[in-house]
């Protein structure tokens, strides 16, 4: 059973992930972003279901494409280089979902834009955080 300290750690990690995703979304939606039109052509895949931490596998599998999209943006839109930002997110996601169990992600048929994709995972983080608190 999860202890209060492990729950607190999970909550902090989710909050960190949430902030990272929100920062990316804000950077992309920046009105000075000249690459937004092209960024929106990139297809992202959404999970059929995202209600548990193991479903973060679906986010993890989209972090490569996410890094490529962020490479298009001007670096001043973000505090970190895309490679470092994605690397940080990968560490958090791996700790949250664990590396031991190999969960195979199921994707929805409809693809999404980067904005829809980020909003979906922001909502996921907020939802899990609310259950922990």
């Amino acid at each position: 059973a999860p202890t209060s300290s492990s729950t607190k750690k999970t909550q902090l990690q989710l909050e960190h992930l949430l902030l990272d995703l929100q920062m990316i979304l804000n950077g992309i939606n920046n009105y000075k972003n000249p690459k937004l039109t092209r960024m929106l052509t990139f297809k992202f895949y959404m999970p059929k279901k995202a209600t548990e931490l193991k479903h973060l596998q679906c986010l993890e599998e989209e972090l490569g494409p996410l890094e490529e999209v962020l490479n298009l943006a001007q670096s001043k839109n973000f505090h970190l280089r895309p490679r470092d930002l994605i690397s940080n997110i990968r560490v958090i996601v791996l700790e949250l979902k664990g590396s031991e169990t190999t969960f195979m992600c199921e994707y929805a048929d409809e693809t999404a834009t980067i904005v829809e994709f980020l909003n979906r995972w922001i909502t996921f983080c907020q939802s899990i955080i609310s259950t922990l608190t």
């Epitope: 993890e60 599998e61 490569g64 490479n71 791996l94």
Partner: antibody, heavy 123, light 107 residues
């Protein structure tokens, strides 16, 4: 169906420079990241680098930095790989291949390949 | 750089038999792994992407699986045209790296 057609075989002397082309047909080159991979005779595959033809941004493997230049001409839907200061160890078949994030998940991998260009470096 | 170690280097089997090829990553790469088949004088051909997904046009006898950093390509019943060299590739981080290959030969 996307097709990649590469330029013909080359024979070069040590120290020389080679430039190989890869023409994309069936789609526009700007839909793809163009990657280059090589294979020495009887050996495995080695990633060289890639270009985003839309904005000419490149990434190179450390082993090739300073010797390789990947470019693209969007007007002709052609990518190029130039390798300088050639040595005998550069004798290999050079392939262009694609990655895209605009279509299916499958095409995020090296789905389309050129037929390969044999470069022989010999004195 | 991420190192992919394939085993065995050579696998000798007969048509109709089951082939199991292994690829081990030196660090965690999630499902960012694909498998390619290469025949002499030809370019590699994508078989499996994202560790377990079958590429279009590839027969269902090919399948991929993953356990941690260990990846497996299985050919359930070998056909004569399956005898070739197989490579794994990681797309987790640049530089992208390939395994050294497994040669599948007719016994």
């Amino acid at each position: 169906q996307v097709q990649l057609v590469q330029s013909g075989a080359e024979v070069k002397k040590p120290g020389a420079t080679v430039k190989i082309s890869c023409k994309v047909s069936g789609d526009t080159i700007t839909a793809y990241y163009m990657h280059w991979v090589r294979q020495a005779p009887g050996q495995g595959l080695e990633w060289i680098g890639r270009i985003d033809p839309e904005d000419d941004s490149t990434k190179y493997a450390e082993n090739f930095k300073g010797r390789v230049t990947i470019t693209a001409d969007t007007s002709t839907d052609t990518a190029y790989m130039e390798l300088s200061s050639l040595r005998s160890e550069d004798t290999a078949v050079y392939y262009c291949t694609t990655v895209t994030f605009l279509y299916s998940r499958e095409l995020r991998w090296f789905a389309y390949w050129g037929q390969g260009t044999l470069v022989t470096v010999s004195s | 750089d991420i190192v992919l170690t394939q085993s065995p280097a050579t696998l000798s089997l007969s048509p109709g038999e089951r082939a199991t090829l292994s690829c081990q990553a030196s660090q965690y790469i999630s499902n960012y792994l694909s498998w390619y088949q290469q025949k002499p004088g030809q370019a590699p051909r994508l078989l499996i992407y994202s560790a377990t997904s079958l590429a279009s046009g590839i027969p269902a006898r090919f399948s991929g699986s993953r356990s941690g950093t260990d990846f497996t390509l299985t050919i359930s019943s070998l056909e004569p045209e399956d005898f070739a060299v197989y490579y794994c590739l990681q797309h987790y981080s640049t530089p992208y790296t390939f395994g050294q290959g497994t040669k599948l030969e007719i016994k």
